[in-house]
């Protein structure tokens, strides 16, 4: 039975040209995390963090995606096109797959918001699918 919950940074905002940290955390389960996949709103993969093999950043994002902190992901040199949904998919054993959602809004540099993940954010909880 899947008992885990994914907590994410929820809805966040950051300035154009800045950076932001996408973070998910799986709790309330003893399941072993074998892999975490980070996916963008158009379903393209940003990165995979395999528990044993390490990080694979997808070629299209290598110049502006940095692994970490932890199982999270740092997006750099943000553009307006980066606005949208991001998903962390936790592959676990024996539970199966858990998924968390983050919504990122990229703001024009002259506007409000923060960089480095320091903008507004609300923590969201997600249960298994």
């Amino acid at each position: 039975m899947m008992t885990g919950t994914i907590e994410t940074t929820g809805n966040i905002s950051a300035k154009k040209g800045g950076s932001v940290i996408l973070q998910c955390h799986l709790s309330s389960t003893m399941a072993q995390v074998t892999q975490v996949n980070w996916e963008q709103h158009d379903h393209s993969l940003l990165a995979i963090r395999n528990a044993e093999l390490g990080w694979h950043i997808y070629p299209a994002f290598k110049d502006r995606v940095a692994p970490g902190p932890g199982l999270g992901l740092t997006l750099q040199s943000l553009t307006m096109n980066d606005t949208g949904e991001y998903f962390c998919t936790y592959h676990t054993y024996p539970d199966g797959t858990y998924r968390g959602r983050i919504f990122l809004e990229v703001l024009e540099s002259s506007g409000g918001g923060g960089a480095g993940g320091g903008g507004h954010h609300h923590h969201h909880h997600h249960h298994h699918h």
Epitope: T34, Q35, N37, E39, H43, S44, L45, I48, N50, E52, L53, G54, W55, H56, Y58, P59, A60, H91
Partner: antibody, heavy 121, light 107 residues
């Protein structure tokens, strides 16, 4: 240039243990990457068996897990496959391969030439 | 396990033809797909990774595309040395699986 070379007996009796080694040339297996075994039954497709990571951790195909052991001999810069309780269904060409996960994800960029193992009495 | 279904299982084409092979995943694998070429009696060779990126030294006539569940491998102008069996592989999940292969022959 990285090179991998499989070796081991070409004939194994049913119920016995298949043992193969993969010698790695041009790279120290304890320096990085993961090192895999894949097999291909005659006229059929490829099946991933498992790997040993340079750190020593292992991961196996669930369908074979109860019978498979992959280990590293650092002194000889080689890694090995043991598959127990073999049957005719284990007859295949066995390949060793390297995975550069950081650059190519789960794609395998260097392969050995393969060695045919026949299970027969 | 994620199943990878390739089609066709075999095909015959002429030198200079555009050749297309498809691979369908049993579930969404985003762009975590590789393509290999295997010539008779030889080991597979990596051609494409991350669905559309050519591996080092791979000729530009080889290309890959797709995301989600549907993937395509294309040879823009078939050469005699391209006669081989081609395999797709997914690595979205932690258990890697391959397609059944497509055997390519010259007419």
């Amino acid at each position: 240039q990285v090179q991998l070379q499989e070796s081991g007996p070409g004939l194994v009796k049913p119920s016995e243990t298949l043992s193969l080694t993969c010698a790695v040339y041009g790279y120290s297996i304890t320096s990085g990457y993961s090192w895999h075994w894949i097999r291909q039954p005659p006229g059929k497709g490829l099946e991933w068996i498992g790997y040993v990571h340079y750190s020593g951790s292992t991961n196996y195909n669930p369908s074979l897990k109860s019978r498979v052991t992959i280990s590293v001999d650092t002194s000889k810069n080689q890694f090995s496959l043991k598959l127990s309780s073999v049957t005719a269904a284990d007859t295949a060409v066995y390949y060793c391969a390297r995975m550069d996960y950081g650059n190519y994800g789960g794609a395998m960029d260097y392969w050995g030439q393969g060695t045919l193992v026949t299970v027969s009495s | 396990d994620i199943q990878m279904t390739q089609s066709p299982s075999s095909l015959s084409a002429s030198v200079g033809d555009r050749v297309t092979i498809t691979c369908k995943a049993s579930q969404d694998v985003r762009t975590a797909v590789a393509w290999y070429q295997q010539k008779p009696g030889k080991a597979p060779k990596l051609l494409i990774y991350s669905a559309s990126y050519r591996y080092t030294g791979v000729p530009s006539r080889f290309s890959g595309s797709g995301s989600g569940t549907d993937f395509t491998f294309t040879i823009s102008s078939l050469q005699p040395e391209d006669i081989a069996t081609y395999y797709c592989q997914q690595y979205y999940s932690t258990q890697w699986t391959f397609g059944g292969g497509t055997k390519l022959e010259i007419k």
